[in-house]
Interface confidence: low
């Protein structure tokens, strides 16, 4: 059928990997607080997945606020190189393979894989779409490669680690992790799926910006929002190409100070999720 054909249309943009944060406060919105000072601070932006500048009012706010770009990166972005090197050299499972499955605080219900230390195999679980822990893989193969034992009791493949000829160090090679991203598509592509208020059950697609994919959902027939497409391809056309890699890896995206005062002491769950 035509939708089957559409399925194989080439979308060249890199898919976003799962969002895995070190601390839950990294998912909070930038909160300038109720005071009127103009102080340059940094916060971790869950949409662009990087630390960015914002203007802090000087009081209250939340924990997603750092004095320097370096401090923000240290707290909210993962550098797993040391752990990867250690596990590769010692042929051990990474520590996170032994963590319990963690759905996180959001409500996307994405099928993911985790290593179950009881059964010694990778299994599916429901991931909410944000936070959680690193025992969380997009594909079964990735989970098996990292956490399951190979036939000889060793890991099958530890992140594709290879020797870097420049500094003779081990470097993790990953095709999945993008560099810096900006979203230039329609703003509604960043909103959650919204069933609306009626009682129908229509098959629709919405763009899940956490995982960078279009997923099906049930639309009630009225209301809702614009992140609502009748086909997967229409969804991809509208939203997928919005994620583009930044040309320059330097510089910061500035967040304008809000004119109208809004209390935004809310976690990612409220940003991204609507009770339906």
């Amino acid at each position: 059928d035509s939708e089957e054909d559409e399925e194989h249309t080439i979308i060249t943009d890199t898919e976003l990997p799962p969002l895995k944060l070190m601390h839950s406060f990294c998912a909070f919105k930038a909160d300038d607080g109720p005071c009127k000072a103009i102080m340059k601070r940094f916060f971790f932006n869950i949409f662009t997945r990087q630390c960015e500048e914002f203007i802090y009012g000087g009081c209250e706010g939340n924990q997603n606020r750092f004095e320097s770009l370096e401090e923000c990166k240290k707290m909210c972005t993962r550098d797993n190189a040391n752990r990867i090197i250690k596990t590769t050299l010692q042929q051990e499972k990474p520590d996170f393979c032994f963590l319990e499955e963690d759905p996180g605080i959001c409500r996307g219900y994405i099928t993911r894989y985790f290593y179950n230390n009881q059964t010694k195999q990778c299994e599916r679980f429901k991931y909410g779409g944000c936070l959680g822990n690193m025992n969380n893989f997009e594909t079964l193969e990735e989970c098996k490669n990292i956490c399951e034992d190979g036939p000889n009791g060793f890991q099958v493949d530890n992140y594709g680690t290879q020797l870097n000829a420049v500094n003779n160090s081990l470097t993790p090679q990953s095709t999945k992790v993008p560099s810096l991203f900006e979203f230039h598509g329609p703003s509604w592509c960043l909103t959650p799926a919204d069933r609306g208020l009626c009682r129908a059950n229509e098959n629709r697609f919405y763009y899940n910006s956490v995982i960078g994919k279009c997923r099906p959902f049930k639309y009630s027939g009225c209301g809702g929002n614009e992140n609502n497409f009748t086909s997967k391809q229409e969804c991809l056309r509208a939203c997928k190409k919005g994620f583009i890699q930044r040309i320059s890896k330097g510089g910061l995206i500035k967040t304008k100070r809000k004119r109208k005062k809004q209390r935004v002491k809310i976690a990612y769950e409220e940003i991204f999720v609507k009770n339906m």
Partner: antibody, heavy 122, light 111 residues
Framework: EVQLQQSGTVLARPGASVKMSCKAS????????IHWVKQRPGQGLEWIGA????????TYSQKFKDKAKLTAVTSASTAFMELNSLTNDDSAVYYC???????????????WGQGTTLTVSS | DIVLTQSPASLAVSLGQRATISCRAS??????????MHWYQQKPGQPPKLLIY???KLESGVPARFSGSGSETDFTLNIHPVEEEDAATYFC?????????FGGGTKLEIK
């Protein structure tokens, strides 16, 4: 109209292997997972495993991981389940079903095949 | 594995009366307000048919006399008023994680 059409009744000898099919139509085959469920006569339903036809990722119940092998051929919109080393305990009706993922509502089986009856007998 | 225990195993209900079927999970199947418990109806010689998903949501085309409720570990399927065509076996099923599991089934007879 969404349909899952399963292959017909199979009679097999103990120790043999069988492969049954589930042909999907009326929707994009690669978008939805296909699950397999076993039902022995007069008994309940047992989940065997599931396959994502889009990339052939398969996941199995611990109980069936050495018994069943799930595959899919996207060009034919067909999922397959192969059962090996058959015993009398494998005699059952086997259903394929489509898993629907609807965001906030979780996921579940919205369409089922009519079932393939397997009888293992010497 | 999550074990789903259905009760009763069978029940006979008079036409027009209420049928109540219970399903208890060995651990919670709810995450952040979504209840990953679903109900199916199966008639002899037929595959199961989805009735209720996410504990309480009625599948399209299913009569409104079917309703579901519950959260965490305790779920209920209600049929009211019961009709002749409702004679069948009813199964609950959870999808919070692999392996997906089903309840043992409840056979409903109409008196």
């Amino acid at each position: 109209e969404v349909q899952l059409q399963q292959s017909g009744t199979v009679l097999a000898r103990p120790g043999a292997s069988v492969k049954m099919s589930c042909k999907a139509s009326g929707y994009s085959f690669t978008t939805y997972w296909i699950h397999w469920v076993k039902q022995r006569p007069g008994q309940g339903l047992e989940w065997i495993g599931a396959i994502d036809p889009g990339n052939s990722d398969a996941t199995y119940s611990q109980k069936f991981k050495d018994k069943a092998k799930l595959t899919a051929v996207t060009s034919a919109s067909t999922a397959f389940m192969e059962l090996n080393s058959l015993t009398n305990d494998d005699s059952a009706v086997y259903y394929c079903s489509r898993e629907v993922y609807y965001g906030y509502d979780g996921d579940y089986f919205d369409y089922w095949g009519q079932g393939t009856t397997l009888t293992v007998s010497s | 594995d999550i074990v789903l225990t259905q009760s009763p195993a069978s029940l006979a209900v008079s036409l027009g009366q209420r049928a109540t079927i219970s399903c208890r999970a060995s651990e919670s199947v709810s995450v952040h307000g979504t209840h990953l418990m679903h109900w199916y109806q199966q008639k002899p010689g037929q595959p199961p048919k989805l009735l209720i998903y996410a504990a309480s949501k009625l599948e399209s085309g299913v009569p409104a006399r079917f309703s579901g409720s519950g959260s965490e570990t305790d779920f209920t399927l209600n049929i009211h008023p019961v009709e002749e065509e409702d004679a069948a076996t009813y199964f609950c099923q959870q999808s919070i994680g692999d392996p997906w599991t089903f309840g043992g089934g409840t056979k409903l007879e109409i008196k």
